[in-house]
């Protein structure tokens, strides 16, 4: 048996931070978890990690840099990054492993999630026009 | 990176024995629920048995009764003592361990290799 996962086809983050929602068909209320973020086509990259303990608080890391955060529904685990560059545009996976009680359980691979990073085009306006020509 | 290498798999008479051992090795902080899984050709993976950091065994309705998972925290080795097999038993036997790398992280998911035990008169 696998976990089924949702996520939003794509996303944009217009400020360099963006909220990814991983919806699960699992309920993972006192269950022991590890779900995850991946970057990339061969999800080589692991963005952020939330684990999951029922005698334990929430655990939110990245080993790879990514400034990312997690907040923890029933059935469900949003990402949310921030800082983000525009060269980090890319695919992005969920997965989910639920390790206790047993057996363990993960997912079939989603579809995934295009990040968009918009960066921040800046037109500054001059605070003093310049000379008016008649 | 967390390795699992199990051994003991082989051939065995109907009602016979066998002990299977998975052992870790590399860069572990701490070993935490350690389990046992199978897998024939015909099946998708089957759980086995479970024994958590505690000592807490869990086993499906399957091999209750006869079969029994231990573990040894000071070699890092989690065993499955298999009795009274039946040829249904015959699979590809993996260990699953949920390691810690690193103080102050949360733990990982590992698996190994697998270890055939074939049940045949």
């Known amino acids: 048996n696998k976990i089924l996962v949702k996520q939003s086809p794509m996303l944009v983050a217009y400020d360099n931070a963006v909220n990814l929602s991983c919806k699960y068909s699992y309920n993972l209320f006192s269950r022991e978890f590890r779900a995850s973020l991946h970057k990339g086509l061969d999800s080589a990259v692991e963005v952020c990690v939330v684990y999951g303990n029922y005698s334990q608080q929430l655990q939110v890391y990245s080993k790879t840099g990514f400034n990312c955060d997690g907040k923890l529904g029933n059935e469900s685990v949003t990402f949310y990054l921030q800082n983000l560059y525009v060269n980090q545009t890319d695919i992005y996976f969920c997965k989910i492993e639920v390790m206790y009680p047993p057996p363990y359980l993960d997912n079939e691979k989603s579809n995934g999630t295009i990040i968009h990073v918009k960066g921040k085009h800046l037109c500054p306006s001059p605070l003093f026009p310049g000379p008016s020509k008649p | 990176e967390v390795q699992l290498v199990e051994s003991g798999g082989g051939l065995v008479q109907p009602g016979g024995s066998l002990r299977l051992s998975c052992a870790a090795s590399?860069?572990?902080?701490?070993?935490?629920?350690m389990e046992w899984y199978r897998r024939t050709p015909e099946t998708q993976r089957e759980w086995v048995a479970t024994?958590?950091?505690?000592?807490?065994?869990n086993y499906p309705d399957s091999v209750k009764g006869r079969f029994t998972i231990s573990r040894d925290d000071t070699k890092k080795t989690v065993y499955l003592q298999m009795n009274s097999l039946k040829p249904e038993d015959t699979a590809v036997y993996y260990c699953?361990?949920?390691?810690?790398?690193?103080?102050?992280?949360?733990?990982?998911?590992?698996w190994g290799q697998g270890t055939l035990v074939t049940v045949s008169s």
């Open positions: 699953h361990a949920v390691a810690t790398e690193d103080a102050g992280f949360p733990p990982s998911n590992y």
């Open positions: 590399g860069s572990i902080f701490r070993l935490h629920t």
């Open positions: 024994i958590t950091s505690g000592g807490t065994t």
